[in-house]
């Protein structure tokens, strides 16, 4: 069938359109194009005779049409009036006619639109704004863009006038955005330049910064005010209601207590005509003096004197604080604070109370610290120590003893031998000693400030013969596989060899045995029950030797896995069941029994007379050692058969 296709269907003014013929019949005589939907000689555009290839213009010919041999019609420089239907009339050789109609529409090329507004400076929460997209164009679609996004859904946004007008009701500062409109028709689309909506708002309640309201006398006061506003706000400052200046910042150098008061910032928007104020109360405090500490006793005696430290000066309505060793005061019954905290009393001072001590005066802004004070606590002398610790010396050696006692001020020392004063020195030296130098050596330490004296007496024996040694231990009851034990051979003697024996034998080679301190100390690591032996130490020099009494190590161990005897597990009915439980343990373990999980008696032996098959079950012996903290158990199954039913059964006890 003969059809007409318009390419394109929608044609822009000034462009061209091709009316393309499809299914043109064979053996044609000619054809003609008409404007409209029917053949009308008055509206003929052009005719064409195939035999002569002659095109003849018709009444509707405009000079812009070109006809092609295939019957297609090209129309150039399209005008709005070209819109409509076009009919092709085909005359075949047999003079039979055929018609086909096509159409196209003509649209103008759209101009670039622009936005007009009914209110260039709307006021927030008060005004509405109507944007209109210009020009008004027939057959055009209108679209709107906000910040290059399509319109948000909002009850305050309304489109009207065929979407050509966008109205914003009750504008807010958030409506300040880039607005564009767009016009579209089938042949073109154009977007306007952006229009920025300038919403007048504010001022909001101003904020004053910094937030600090407390100042010290002598500081600078620098306040800044800010309020959200369009156009920017104009600022004024008032102090205690009196106008100061029209600036955003208020600066007052070197303030005094007199500058305390209410500071008001007023923000004004000349376009909206609105004013907002914020008030802050500024307090200026007088600078307190630096505190200092006085003491009622600059040289207190340990365990005798009390010391009262007072924080000066005395100021009414002031909080006093104290620190010791840069820490807040510890809780101690020896530390007492007065009701106003101004006086700190140390009852019965000790040498550890030297400090330093600091007091502080707290005002509303900060704490002022005093300089630290250190107490000169007089103490001692403590019991003097005489070194070296040797008590036995061989004849012919030099005896050099030194004495020391903790004391403040440092102690004065004196030496006495057998009660007779020798010399007032810290060290005593006697060369080439003999047996006659044996005796009681006393060191006396004296504290001249406190008047206290302390003495220590040491027995010095000068002899070629060594004394009988003894063994001291750091752990009298070590736990197996856990503890170590250190035996020390006493006394410590000069130029002496120390020896050890275990069960009368010399020490075995073992990584668990270690000698130290010149062989004077024997350490047993990870003791075992086999270490529970007799230990003897010996001392010897070139002229004598001596041995200690034996010390037996009491090793706590166990309980090991218990053993239930007799081993029998099958019994005849009527026999007595007599089970004994044993576990290696030191101290002896605590024994208890359970039958089928039910606790029985707390004994080592379990006795049941005349058992029956009801006594079948599991018999568990539990052992515990409270010293090692360990427990153990064993379970034995007992079967009781009726008399004579099974051979080889135990008759029981």
């Amino acid at each position: 069938k003969l059809t007409i296709e318009s390419t394109p269907f929608n044609v822009a003014e000034g462009k061209e359109v091709l009316l393309l013929v499809h299914n043109l019949p064979q053996h044609l005589f000619g054809y003609s194009w008409y404007k409209g939907e029917r053949v009308d000689g008055n509206r003929q555009i052009i005719g064409y005779v195939i035999g002569t290839q002659q095109a003849t213009p018709g009444p509707a010919y405009s000079g812009r049409e070109i006809i092609y041999p295939n019957a297609s019609l090209l129309i150039q420089n399209i005008i709005q009036n070209d819109t409509g239907f076009y009919t092709l009339h085909v005359i075949k050789s047999d003079l039979v006619n055929e018609e086909a109609t096509g159409q196209f529409r003509v649209y103008p090329e759209l101009p670039k639109p622009s936005i007009s507004s009914n209110n260039s400076k709307p006021v927030e929460d008060k005004d509405a704004v109507a944007f209109t997209c210009e020009p008004e164009t027939q057959d055009a679609t209108y679209l709107w863009w906000v910040n290059n996004q399509s319109l948000p859904v909002s009850p305050r946004l309304q489109l009207s006038n065929g979407n050509r007008t966008l109205t914003l009701f009750n504008v807010t500062r958030n409506d300040t955005a880039s607005y564009k409109c767009e016009t579209q028709n089938p042949v073109s689309a154009r977007r306007s330049d952006s229009v920025i909506l300038n919403v007048l708002y504010g001022p909001d309640a101003p904020t004053i910064s910094p937030l600090n309201t407390s100042y010290r006398s002598g500081e600078n006061l620098n306040l800044s005010c800010h309020a959200a506003s369009n156009p920017p706000a104009q600022y004024s400052w008032f102090v205690n209601g009196t106008f100061q200046q029209s600036t955003q910042e208020l600066f007052i150098p070197n303030i005094t207590v007199n500058n305390s008061g209410s500071y008001t910032c007023q923000a004004h928007n000349s376009d909206t005509g609105l004013n907002r104020t914020t008030v802050t109360t500024i307090t200026v405090y007088a600078e307190p003096p630096k505190p200092f500490i006085t003491s009622n006793n600059s040289n207190p005696v340990e365990d005798e004197d009390a010391v009262a430290l007072t924080c000066e000066p005395e100021i009414q309505n002031t909080t006093y604080l104290w620190w010791v060793n840069n820490q807040s005061l510890p809780v101690s019954p020896r530390l007492q604070l007065s009701n106003d905290n101004r006086t700190l009393t140390l009852l019965s001072v000790t040498r550890n109370d030297v400090g330093p001590y600091e007091c502080g005066i707290q005002n509303e802004l900060s704490v002022d610290h005093s300089d630290p004070v250190i107490l000169n606590v007089l103490y001692g002398p403590d019991d003097p120590t005489i070194s070296p610790s040797y008590t036995y010396y061989r004849p012919g050696v030099n005896l050099s003893l030194s004495c020391h006692a903790a004391s403040n001020p440092p102690a004065q020392y004196s030496w006495l031998i057998d009660g007779n004063i020798q010399q007032h020195t810290q060290e005593l030296f006697i060369s080439n000693i003999t047996e006659k130098n044996s005796g009681l050596y006393t060191c006396q330490a004296n504290n001249s400030a406190s008047g206290h004296s302390r003495t220590t007496v040491k027995t010095i024996t000068v002899s070629a013969e060594l004394p009988k040694p003894s063994i001291s231990s750091n752990n009298s009851k070590p736990v197996e596989d856990k503890d170590a034990v250190a035996f020390t051979c006493e006394p410590e003697a000069q130029n002496t060899t120390y020896l050890w024996w275990v069960n009368g034998q010399s020490l075995p080679v073992s990584p668990r045995l270690q000698l130290s301190n010149g062989n004077r100390t024997l350490t047993l690591f990870n003791v075992t029950r086999n270490d529970a032996r007799a230990y003897v130490c010996g001392i010897q020099n070139s002229v004598s030797a001596n041995r200690s009494d034996p010390v037996t190590l009491d090793v706590l161990y166990g309980p090991d896995t218990p053993i239930i005897s007799p081993p029998d597990s099958s019994y005849l009915s009527g026999a007595n069941l007599n089970l004994s439980c044993h576990s290696a343990s030191n101290p002896s373990p605590q024994y208890s029994w359970r039958i089928n999980g039910i606790p029985q008696q707390h004994t080592q032996v379990l006795f049941i007379a005349k058992i029956t098959p009801n006594n079948n079950g599991t018999y568990a012996c539990f052992v515990s050692n409270l010293a090692t903290g360990r427990n153990n158990s064993i379970v034995k199954s007992i079967t009781v058969s009726a008399s004579g039913t099974s051979p080889g059964l135990s008759a029981g006890a």
Epitope: P587, S592, T603
Partner: antibody, heavy 120, light 107 residues
């Protein structure tokens, strides 16, 4: 009902001898380690001697060692205390007790006691 | 020998009160400690063993605590039947020794 009943307490002269008995009933006597404990007139409690369940192990404090002997007859469910060379400080109520756990256990059960007075 | 030091020697209290008796061992006895109650004219009765285990039938107002060398027996909400003498005793092997006792009397 578990019972321990002591007997044999009398007045005896210093240097004299005495044998106390304790009859057990209501429990498996042969299973329990036993001890004698005495209470002096000043109400002080003193442990006197210990014997294990089988009778093979005994312990004595130094105050009675060599003078007192503990024994038991499991067939008769009876515990004994043979005392000799008695002294006035041996005057006390003598209690028969049964142990929990063996030699590392407390005195779980006590008899009503029998009074021994040593006086000239 | 291990010495047991018990305190106080005597104590007066009222029904409903809480009292504590203490016992100190001269050396480490771990948890091998028992407490006994003795009423006038009666035999002692075992209350607590292994320092804190209550004997069957002993009311829960009694409680024992401690280990090593320091021990205590606490009686909450004293009842009339609780008055009498209390003794501690170590059972850390022989020789067993007792404390000197605490007499608890009605105020």
């Amino acid at each position: 009902e578990l019972q321990l009943v002591e007997s044999g307490g009398v007045l005896v002269k210093p240097g004299g001898s005495l044998k106390l008995s304790c009859a057990a009933s209501g429990f498996a006597f042969s299973s329990y380690d036993m001890s004698w404990v005495r209470q002096t007139p000043e109400k002080r409690l003193e442990w006197v001697t210990y014997i294990n369940s089988g009778g093979g192990i005994t312990y004595y404090p130094d105050t009675v060692k060599g003078r007192f002997t503990i024994s038991r007859d499991n067939a008769r469910n009876t515990l004994y205390l043979q005392m000799s060379s008695l002294k006035s400080e041996d005057t006390a109520i003598y209690y028969c007790t049964a142990h929990y756990f063996g030699s590392s256990g407390p005195f779980a059960y006590w008899g009503q006691g029998t009074l021994v007075t040593v006086s000239a | 020998d291990i010495q047991m030091t018990q305190s106080p020697a005597s104590l007066s209290a009222s029904v409903g009160e809480t009292v504590t008796i203490t016992c100190r061992a001269s050396e480490n006895i771990y948890s091998y400690l028992a407490w006994y109650q003795q009423k006038q004219g009666k035999s002692p009765q075992l209350l607590v063993y292994n320092a804190k285990t209550l004997t069957e039938g002993v009311p829960s107002r009694f409680s024992g605590s401690g280990s090593g060398t320091q021990f205590s027996l606490k009686i909450n909400s004293l009842q009339p039947e609780d008055f009498g003498s209390y003794y501690c005793q170590h059972h850390y092997g022989t020789p067993f020794t007792f404390g000197s006792g605490t007499k608890l009397e009605i105020k």
